[in-house]
């Protein structure tokens, strides 16, 4: 008799999820000498333990604590780049500017990037058919709680000037409901962070507007200022040129506004 299975609104667990997590862990620890001590089998066991046999709408940050402990990593606190709705460019930037880090450049972020996972209450099975959608089903699902947990810890670790890349092509350049707006902004530590520096990335070739004056950016500035952190903002009109100049600041095209 086939068991009844809960149908969720979101896509199911990414295929070959256990193998992918384990392979990513091995690759990361090989590339990053400071993480060579990490036992990837233990990491997978802790990851699995956070959601297997648990109701996928009832996951807590506490469930991920064993994984957080195993994945503890020190990144230079003044070299943190946050991003919102512009992940690809942020990652391209840190691939060039190797001393800066997005969350996905850390072990735990790297393991989970672009993956989906969930289990089922009272069975050891991974659900490859469907997983809860944050909006349509529940917010306390395994993926959302994971990213909330690691994002909070990442923001708490930041110091000096914290950089954030924002998508100037979106209707809400700063979105209070994004992970950046709902988690990271509120977990920057004013006693450690002097300034939040926003880089607003323009999408259109001929877009010369000052998007730092956008109402949502002003809202971000207000939230940050109330937390006793300074705020600054810079338009990046030509993201392609920006990346080129990060690679090679000597290039003659880097003399003008980017």
């Amino acid at each position: 008799v086939p068991r009844w299975r809960q149908q969720w609104s979101g896509p199911g667990t990414t295929k070959r999820f256990p193998e992918t997590v384990l392979a990513r862990c091995v690759k990361y620890t090989e590339i990053h000498p400071e993480m060579r001590h990490v036992d990837c089998q233990s990491v997978w066991d802790a990851f699995k333990g956070a959601f297997i046999s648990k109701h996928p709408c009832n996951i807590t940050e506490e469930d991920y604590q064993p994984l957080m402990k195993l994945g503890t990593q020190t990144v230079p606190c003044n070299k943190i780049l946050l991003w919102s709705r512009i992940k690809d460019l942020a990652h391209q930037f840190t691939q060039v500017q190797r001393d800066m880090f997005t969350l996905e450049d850390t072990l735990l972020g790297y393991l989970a990037d672009d993956l989906t996972w969930c289990g089922e209450f009272n069975t050891s099975k991974i659900n490859y058919q469907s997983c809860p959608d944050w909006r349509k089903d529940c917010s306390n699902n395994p993926v959302s709680v994971f990213w909330k947990t690691v994002s909070r810890r990442f923001a708490e670790a930041a110091c000096d000037v914290v950089h954030v890349m924002l998508n100037g092509s979106r209707s809400k350049i700063f979105d209070k409901n994004s992970t950046f707006g709902s988690v990271e902004v509120h977990n920057l530590q004013p006693e450690k962070v002097q300034t939040l520096e926003a880089w607003v990335i323009h999408g259109g070739r001929e877009d010369s507007r000052d998007l730092c004056q956008d109402p949502t950016i002003k809202e971000l500035e207000s939230i940050i200022s109330k937390r006793n952190i300074q705020f600054s903002c810079k338009n990046i009109y030509r993201p392609d040129k920006f990346l080129q100049c990060v690679k090679n600041p000597e290039d003659s095209s880097c003399t003008s506004e980017i």
Epitope: Q97, V161, A198, Q230, C245, P249, I258
Partner: nanobody, 122 residues
Framework: QVQLQESGGRLVQPGGSLRLSCAAS????????MAWFRQGPGKEREFVAS???????LYADFVKGRFTISRDNAKNTVYLQMDSLKPEDTTVYYC????????????????WGQGTQVTVSS
């Protein structure tokens, strides 16, 4: 290539003020983070303040509330306003530049000026 030239250093009394300037040539400063460092004889180069391409500032704890870094991109110049000067501020002050982001580590700056001497004494 960015060339940097500091000026404004001189003898000043304790409690007095001074404004250092750093003029850049060869590049527009608008894409560059600029910083001031200082170094006494036989000592390590020490971070004082920085201002990024987006004008966010960073200060060493020992100058917070006394020194202010600012920039004028039109004049291709960065300034360090030094108030409430103390005898221990006596040393050579250097201007430095790196693309985009201001940081504290001197090794991360590609371009340096020759320095300007500040002496605080009565």
């Amino acid at each position: 290539q960015v060339q940097l030239q500091e000026s404004g250093g001189r003898l000043v009394q304790p409690g007095g003020s001074l404004r250092l300037s750093c003029a850049a040539s060869g590049r527009t400063l608008s894409n560059y983070a600029m910083a001031w460092f200082r170094q006494g004889p036989g000592k390590e180069r020490e971070f004082v303040a920085s201002i990024s391409a987006s004008d966010s500032t960073l200060y060493a704890d020992f100058v917070k509330g006394r020194f202010t870094i600012s920039r004028d991109n039109a004049k291709n110049t960065v300034y360090l306003q030094m108030d409430s000067l103390k005898p221990e501020d006596t040393t050579v002050y250097y201007c430095a530049a790196r693309f985009w982001i201001g940081v504290r580590a001197p090794a991360e700056y590609n371009y340096w000026g020759q320095g300007t001497q500040v002496t605080v004494s009565s």
